[in-house]
Each structure stands twice: as C-alpha cells, then as structure tokens.
Interface confidence: medium
C-alpha cells in the first residue's frame, strides 16, 4: 500500500506542493489522515498527520469544548493507494477568530499561544491578549496547556494558551480519536506563564488556618476565622460535544477546483461561540503539500 505522508504543526507541512508518498510495511492495509483544530477567542490553528495507519477503514469526526477552547477532530482511514488526501488540512497562519474590536476588553490579560512552537511559547515570551466576553460567556480565566494529535505512528504536540471561561480548572482535558487537549486555568492577568505544576488547591477551597495557641489568661479571645463558602460548585464535567461537521469534499483530480485551503465548517457554532464570525472554521490545506503541499 502507498500512502501520502506529512506532518503539520500549525504550519504548512501538509500543503499542496509538499506532498510525500510512502510505501507501507507489509500487513499495513490502511492509509490514515487526521486533523485536529483548536480555536481560542483570539485565533485558531491545527495539527495534521498523514501516513500509513492501522485498524479499519472509516471516518470519525468530533467536536469538543474545554472551558471555551474549541477543538475539532477529523480522522479518516481508507484502504486504497494514496487515498488519504480527502480532508482539508489547515496549513496557513490563522486569522483572528472574529471581529474582536466588537467586544470590549473585560480587564483580564492572558498570554496567548495560538499555533506557536514550544520555544516561542515559553514563560512570558508569548504575546499578551486582552480577554473579552462573547455570547453571554465570561472569559476571565487564563489557560496554559497542550494539544496532542497521534496518528500513523506519529505524535505531534503544541502548546495552547489563551483566555477561557474557567479561572480554577486544574489539569482538565478533553479527548477525541487520537487527540487530547489538556491544561490548567488560573485567575488574574498574565497568570498563565506556566501552569504545568499547578496543584489542585484553588481559591475555591477554604484555606486551612492555623489558630494561635490558647492564651493562659481567661480573657475570651475575640479572634474569629472567616472562610468563604460562596464559591460556586464546579460541575464535574465542562466538556460539551459540538455538532459534527459537514462532510468534506473528497480529493479530486487536479482538473477540479483547488480547495486545499478551504476551511471545514461545523454545521453549527459551538456554544459560546456562535457570534464569532468564523466560528467553527478551520483553515485547511488539504492537497498535496503545497507550500503548503509541496508539489508544484
């Protein structure tokens, strides 16, 4: 079996001119392609893999939501030579997710890593963005985490930072086929420079207060300890499925319209993102790996 092969990490690794072919090992009878797109309120990016796969032919699409970070995963496996170029793979720099100027900043700033390499997303080096509230959802938390896509015996991963709806999540994650988006949230501007070692203690948990030892005198102590119990109860899961996307146009011969860079669209916007102008759209450069798919 011969399959197309490429790896894309928020770049043009799977663009039309950059397509490779590989011969699969004996016994491997499916080609695979997987794309995972992540959207924050300040932009979007995608990971993609093509190559020789394992398992059965078929498709698996899924939409996920982690505290307002949206993820969309498409996995396709097929059993014909070079059949794994049907999905539109994102391979372009990503545009803002909407007209951000339409939303007033809510006062919180977060470090933003949208399609940045791990080197560019270290500590306080990433760009800072102003959070805003959209679709009746409050984005006052900052997030620090990772997105990982595994397919064709290849794992690609990129950091993710940005504004989210939760200020206290700790090591939360959502998963799809070969896909994981996980990380932690924090409260306060620019608090998400590094949450890798965040523990499960948060402001929502009343602090343990060490009382002073009793005085030897008999005078009654007027010291009082106040603990806040008004923190909202956190739901056990904040993961919400998103509508499945419309099916993508299968790869056609070059005599047909070039559509490698078209973004797959969800049939509907995810909750909390309906009014973002390109909600659910992920640039995708499917074809050969142009500059994008290095094919010329």
């Amino acid at each position: 079996l011969e399959c197309y092969s490429c790896v894309q990490k928020a770049d043009d690794g799977c663009s039309p001119n950059k397509m490779k072919t590989v011969k699969c090992a004996p016994g491997v009878d499916v080609c695979t392609e997987a794309v995972g797109a992540v959207e924050t309120i300040h932009g979007q990016f995608s990971l993609a893999v093509r190559g020789c796969g394992s398992g059965l032919p078929g498709k698996n699409d899924r939409g996920l939501d982690l505290h307002g970070l949206l993820a969309f995963i498409q996995l396709q496996q097929c059993a014909q030579d070079r059949c794994n170029a049907k999905l539109n793979l994102t391979s372009r720099a990503l545009d803002p997710a909407g007209n951000e100027s339409a939303y007033p900043p809510n006062g919180v700033e977060c470090y933003s890593c949208v399609g940045l390499s791990r080197e560019a997303c270290q500590g306080t080096s990433p760009p800072v963005v102003s959070c805003y509230n959209a679709s009746d959802h409050v984005y006052k938390g900052c997030f620090d985490g990772n997105v990982t896509l595994t397919a064709a015996n290849v794992t690609v991963s990129l950091p993710v930072r940005g504004c989210v709806q939760d200020e206290f999540c700790t090591r939360d994650g959502v998963t799809g086929p070969g896909f994981t988006l996980s990380g932690s949230c924090c409260q306060g501007s620019r608090c998400n420079s590094d949450l890798r070692n965040k523990t499960y203690f948060s402001p929502r948990i009343p602090p343990l207060v060490r009382l002073p030892p009793p005085e030897p005198t008999t005078v009654a102590s007027t010291t009082s300890v106040t603990t806040s119990t008004s923190a909202p109860v956190r739901p056990t899961s904040t993961t919400k499925p998103m509508p499945a996307p419309t099916s993508q146009t299968p790869r056609q011969g070059v005599e047909h319209e070039a559509s490698r860079d078209e973004e797959p669209r969800l049939t509907g916007g995810a909750a909390g993102h309906q009014d973002r102008s390109n909600s659910g759209q992920y640039p995708a450069k499917g074809g050969p790996q142009q500059p994008h798919n290095k094919g010329c």
Epitope: K18, D95, R260, K294
Partner: antibody, heavy 117, light 111 residues
Framework: EVQLLESGGGLVQPGGSLRLSCAAS????????MSWVRQAPGKGLEWVSY????????YYADSVKGRFTISRDNSKNTLYLQMNSLRAEDTAVYYC??????????WGQGTLVTVSS | ESVLTQPPSASGTPGQRVTISCSGS?????????VHWYQQLPGTAPKLLIY???QRPSGVPDRFSGSKSGTSASLAISGLRSEDEADYYC???????????FGGGTKLTVL
C-alpha cells in the same frame, strides 16, 4: 473555464519597481493557493512566490526575498506581485499559476518584465 | 543551475517511444516528494501534464505516463506525434530550498 490573466509588465530601469496583477476567473479564487513563476528568455521555469488562500501565509524564493511582495484581494479575485529593487536578472516572463492538488494546474499567459537601462 | 537535472534535449520519430529523465536528490525527489511534469509548447504558457508522479489530468492522452524511483523520475511518451514537440519540465518540492523546484527543461524534437 479557469482563466488567469496577468498584466503590469513592461520595461523598467534597474532599481525600479513594478506591480504585476493577475485577474482570476472560473473558480473559487478565495479557496486557492496562488503562485508566481517566471521564465527568463530562453531559460527554464523558476518558482518565485506563493500565497495561501486567505493571504495570511506567503513564501518566496531566496532570489527575490526582501524585494518582492506577493498579495491578493479575494474580493477582486486578483493576485499581485510588487517587485522592488529590480535587477537585470529579474528580466523574465512572469506567470501567475493556481496551485491545485499537488501542482500548478492552471497558468496564465504571462507578462514580460524587462529590467534594463 | 537547476536543482533537478534533465537532459537538455531528446528526439524521436513519429510513433516512437521517448523517455525523459529527471534526477534529483535526497532533499526533493529522494525525500519522497511527488513529481510533476509540465509541457510548454512553443510560445505558450506551461501546461500540467503529469501530477503526483503518475497521474494525468483530464484531457491528457494516455500516451503520456510518469514514474518515480528513488531520487529520479521519468516521463514516457509513446506513439510520438509532431504536436508533442515542446519543452518538458519536471518539478518537485525541495526541503533545502523550502520551495518548489523545476528541472532545467528538455526540448523534445520530433524528427
């Protein structure tokens, strides 16, 4: 029918500038990656630059990097190539090409750029 | 000097089979990138002839075929016709140059 029509070529002095245009029709321009490829007189083909469908990603051959700028206006279905600091070796026919699946599947007829004093 | 190497000329008589080679390196064809072939008739723009190593766009006669092996590729034209007289270019992506590269072109003469 896919059509690509280049314009803007002409005679220019070394160090001068030119802006080439490519009017596209017959396909969804806003969904296609586009390229400029040139051919010096009597020579072979040389890729110059390409741009993603949204215009947010651009790429250049080393020979033109820093001097040429590719851009597009999807509302006008037009591709551009701004050429500055032109040199004699930039003399060529410049073709606008659509990047289809894997390859340059449609080409314009070309426009001649002559850099000479 | 072109990154992909082609013979500058080739010739054949009508009805013959002619093969044009395209030699690359480990940063382009040898890296697994697909090869394309373009035909440029005299005084016209190039036209895509073969893409993805061996695929023909609609409208291209099956007399034209492509193949690839290792760091090389080849274009075969069977049943040569006078209208096949043209320049033929191979192309592939190159990792080192980070862009598509072309062969120097082969001028095919039908005797």
């Amino acid at each position: 029918e896919v059509q690509l029509l280049e314009s803007g070529g002409g005679l220019v002095q070394p160090g001068g500038s030119l802006r080439l245009s490519c009017a596209a029709s017959g396909f969804t321009f806003s969904s296609a990656w586009m390229s400029w490829v040139r051919q010096a007189p009597g020579k072979g083909l040389e890729w110059v630059s390409y741009i993603s469908s949204s215009g947010s990603s651009t790429y250049y051959a080393d020979s033109v990097k820093g001097r040429f700028t590719i851009s597009r206006d999807n509302s006008k279905n037009t591709l551009y190539l701004q050429m500055n600091s032109l040199r004699a070796e930039d003399t060529a026919v410049y073709y606008c090409a659509r990047e289809g699946l894997w390859a340059f599947d449609y080409w314009g007829q070309g426009t001649l750029v002559t850099v000479s004093s | 000097e072109s990154v992909l190497t082609q013979p500058p000329s080739a010739s054949g008589t009508p009805g013959q089979r002619v093969t044009i080679s395209c030699s690359g390196s480990s940063s382009n064809i040898g890296a697994g990138y697909v090869v394309h072939w373009y035909q440029q008739l005299p005084g016209t723009a190039p036209k895509l002839l073969i893409y993805d190593n061996n695929q023909r766009p609609s409208g291209v006669p099956d007399r034209f075929s492509g193949s690839k092996s290792g760091t090389s590729a080849s274009l075969a034209i069977s049943g040569l016709r006078s209208e096949d007289e043209a320049d033929y270019y191979c192309a592939a992506w190159d990792d080192r140059l980070n862009g598509p590269v072309f062969g120097g072109g082969t001028k095919l003469t039908v005797l």
